[in-house]
C-alpha cells in the first residue's frame, strides 16, 4: 500500500444515529404496477417469475430489464465484448451474465421477493451491532461512479456483528435506483418495488481479502435498506447526493468528508429479514448473508430525483434502472427477526419458525 494512504484512515468516533424512517408493515402491498413476482407454488417449488416489468427469460430465472418503461438514456444495451478480451455486463443484458460469470446462473441468487406470509419468525435473530460507523469529516472518503452505481469506499474500523462469533468489517456502500417515474430497489416486498435501495457490503473477519471470501458461505454480508419518499429532506443522504454532480461521468472519483454511515441506515436494527443469496452483479458469487431491514429510510422527492438523474454510465447512457430482477428462492426460507408473517395476514395463521443447526 502506498505511503500516505495509511494517513487517509483514521479512528472513527461516536455520533448521532439516524431518524426519519418508516416501517414496511402491512400497508406495503402489491400495486397493479408491481404485482407479486411469485404465485403460490405447487409442491413447495418456486415457479418462474413473471411480471409486468421483469419478463421471464428461458429457464435460468434471469430477466432482461430493458423494459418499455425504461427511459431513452437508460442502460438498455446488452453486455458486449470490448477490445482486449474485455468482458463487460449491463443491466440491459442480464441473460448474458452467466457468460460473464457462470455463478450468475446459480440456484441461490439475489435479489429476491420477500413474501411476508412465507417468512419464518426466528427468535434467535438479534438486533445488529454496528461499531465505528460514525465517521469524522477527516479522513476523507472516496466517492466514485464506476459505471454501474455510486460507491462510497469505507475505511477500516467499521465493525458489524450478525451474531456471536459472526464479525464483519464494512468495505463499501452503494445504491440501486430507477428513474423519476419508475422505482428501482433490488429486493421487493410482496411484489412491491421501492424507489431505491442502499447496500453496505461487509467482509467476514475470517478473511483478509475480498477475493478469498467470494463464494464462501458467510464470507460476505450485506446490509440492505429501502429508500422511500417523504416530505422531509434527509440530511445524512444529502452529504452524498450533493456530490453526485462532481462524479457525473463514468469513472469519476472524488474525496468527500467522512460521514455517519449508520445515519444512512434505519434506526431500528432489530427488525429485519435474513436469507442467504449472492452478489447482485457479476460475478454473482453465492454464500452472501443478506439482511434487509423492515424499516425504510426516508428521502425527499427532490433527493430521489437527484439520485436518478445525476450519473452517467457506459456509452453516454444515463445510469438508471441499475437493479437486477428478483430471483427464484428455489426452496430457500427467508427468516424474519420479528413475526412478519403474522403482521401480513388478516387472520391468524401458523407462524413459520426458523431452523437452527442440528434441527
Amino acid at each position: 500500500q502506498p505511503q500516505g494512504l495509511s494517513g487517509m484512515q483514521g479512528e472513527p468516533s461516536l455520533g448521532d444515529s439516524s431518524s426519519g424512517e418508516d416501517e414496511l408493515g402491512v400497508d406495503v402491498l402489491p400495486s397493479e404496477e408491481d404485482a407479486p413476482e411469485e404465485a403460490d407454488p405447487p409442491d413447495g417449488e418456486d415457479p418462474p417469475e413473471v411480471n409486468s416489468e421483469d419478463r421471464m427469460e428461458e429457464s435460468l430465472g434471469l430477466e432482461d430489464l430493458s423494459t418499455p418503461e425504461a427511459p431513452e438514456h437508460s442502460q438498455g444495451s446488452h453486455g458486449d465484448e470490448k477490445g482486449g478480451g474485455h468482458s463487460h455486463w449491463s443491466y440491459g443484458g442480464t441473460l448474458l451474465w452467466p457468460q460473464v460469470s457462470p455463478a450468475c446462473a446459480g440456484r441461490f441468487q439475489s435479489p429476491v421477493d420477500i413474501r411476508l406470509e412465507r417468512t419464518a419468525f426466528c427468535r434467535t435473530l438479534q438486533p445488529l451491532e454496528l461499531l465505528g460507523y460514525e465517521l469524522q469529516p477527516l479522513p476523507e472518503l472516496s466517492l466514485s461512479n464506476n459505471g454501474h452505481t455510486v460507491q462510497l469506499t469505507l475505511p477500516p474500523g467499521l465493525k458489524m456483528a450478525l451474531g456471536p462469533g459472526q464479525e464483519y468489517r464494512a468495505l463499501q456502500l452503494h445504491l440501486h435506483w430507477g428513474t423519476s417515474d419508475h422505482p428501482g430497489s433490488e429486493h421487493t416486498v410482496n411484489g412491491h418495488r421501492f424507489p431505491a435501495e442502499i447496500h453496505v457490503v461487509h467482509l467476514s473477519t475470517a478473511f483478509s481479502e475480498l477475493h478469498e471470501a467470494l463464494g464462501r458461505p458467510g464470507g460476505l454480508a450485506v446490509l440492505a435498506a429501502f429508500l422511500q419518499e417523504s416530505p422531509e429532506e434527509n440530511s445524512a443522504y444529502e452529504q452524498l447526493l450533493s456530490h453526485l454532480e462532481e462524479i457525473s461521468e463514468e469513472g469519476s472519483k472524488i474525496e468527500i468528508p467522512g460521514l455517519d454511515v449508520s445515519a444512512l441506515l434505519p434506526s431500528d436494527l432489530s427488525r429485519y429479514y435474513r436469507y442467504e443469496g449472492s452478489l447482485t452483479t457479476p460475478p454473482c458469487s453465492q454464500g452472501v448473508i443478506w439482511t434487509v431491514f423492515n424499516e425504510t429510510v426516508k428521502l425527499s422527492a427532490k433527493q430521489l430525483h437527484t439520485l436518478s438523474v445525476s450519473l452517467w454510465g457506459p456509452r453516454d447512457s444515463r445510469l438508471q434502472l441499475n437493479f437486477r430482477a428478483t430471483q427464484p428462492l428455489n426452496g430457500r426460507t427467508i427468516e424474519a427477526s420479528f413475526p412478519a408473517a403474522e403482521d401480513s395476514s388478516p387472520e391468524p395463521v401458523h407462524v413459520n419458525s426458523c431452523f437452527t443447526a442440528g434441527d
Partner: nanobody, 117 residues
Framework: QVQLVESGGGLVQPGGSLRLSCSAS???????????MAWYRQAPGKGLELVAV???????QYSSSVKGRFTISRDNSKKTLYLQMNSLRAEDTAVYYC????????WGQGTQVTVSS
C-alpha cells in the same frame, strides 16, 4: 496472496515516453475483470494523486495534469493494466501505483518514474 505488480518505470528525458504495465496474479486475477482499475502517483514529499481510471466497462477519466498526454487501457484476457505516458515532464516524476477497486482497494508496490535531462 493477491498481487498487482507494476513494471515499465525508469529514467526518461523530458518529452520522452514510457509505458507502465500492471499484472494481476493470485486472487487478483479473479476480480480483475470486474474491478475499476486506476493509476495513482506519489511525488517526493507530496500526497497521493489519482492519475487515471478505467472502469470495468472501459470508461476512462484523467487528472487535468495528464489529460491528452497519458492513456490508460486494460486487457482483461491478460489481466493487465497499462498506462501509456507521452510528452513526459519533470513534474511527472513520482512512484506510480496500480490500484484495483472491487469492493475494496488492492494496491501494487509501485514503480519509479524519473523524468530528467
Amino acid at each position: 496472496q493477491v498481487q498487482l505488480v507494476e513494471s515499465g518505470g525508469g529514467l526518461v528525458q523530458p518529452g520522452g515516453s514510457l509505458r507502465l504495465s500492471c499484472s494481476a496474479s493470485g486472487g487478483a486475477r479473479n476480480i480483475f475483470s470486474f474491478a475499476a482499475m486506476a493509476w495513482y502517483r506519489q511525488a517526493p514529499g507530496k500526497g497521493l494523486e489519482l492519475v487515471a481510471v478505467i472502469t470495468s466497462a472501459g470508461g476512462t477519466q484523467y487528472s487535468s495534469s495528464v489529460k491528452g498526454r497519458f492513456t490508460i487501457s486494460r486487457d482483461n484476457s491478460k489481466k493487465t493494466l497499462y498506462l501509456q505516458m507521452n510528452s513526459l515532464r519533470a513534474e511527472d516524476t513520482a512512484v506510480y501505483y496500480c490500484n484495483a477497486d472491487y469492493y475494496q482497494d488492492y494496491w501494487g508496490q509501485g514503480t519509479q518514474v524519473t523524468v530528467s535531462s
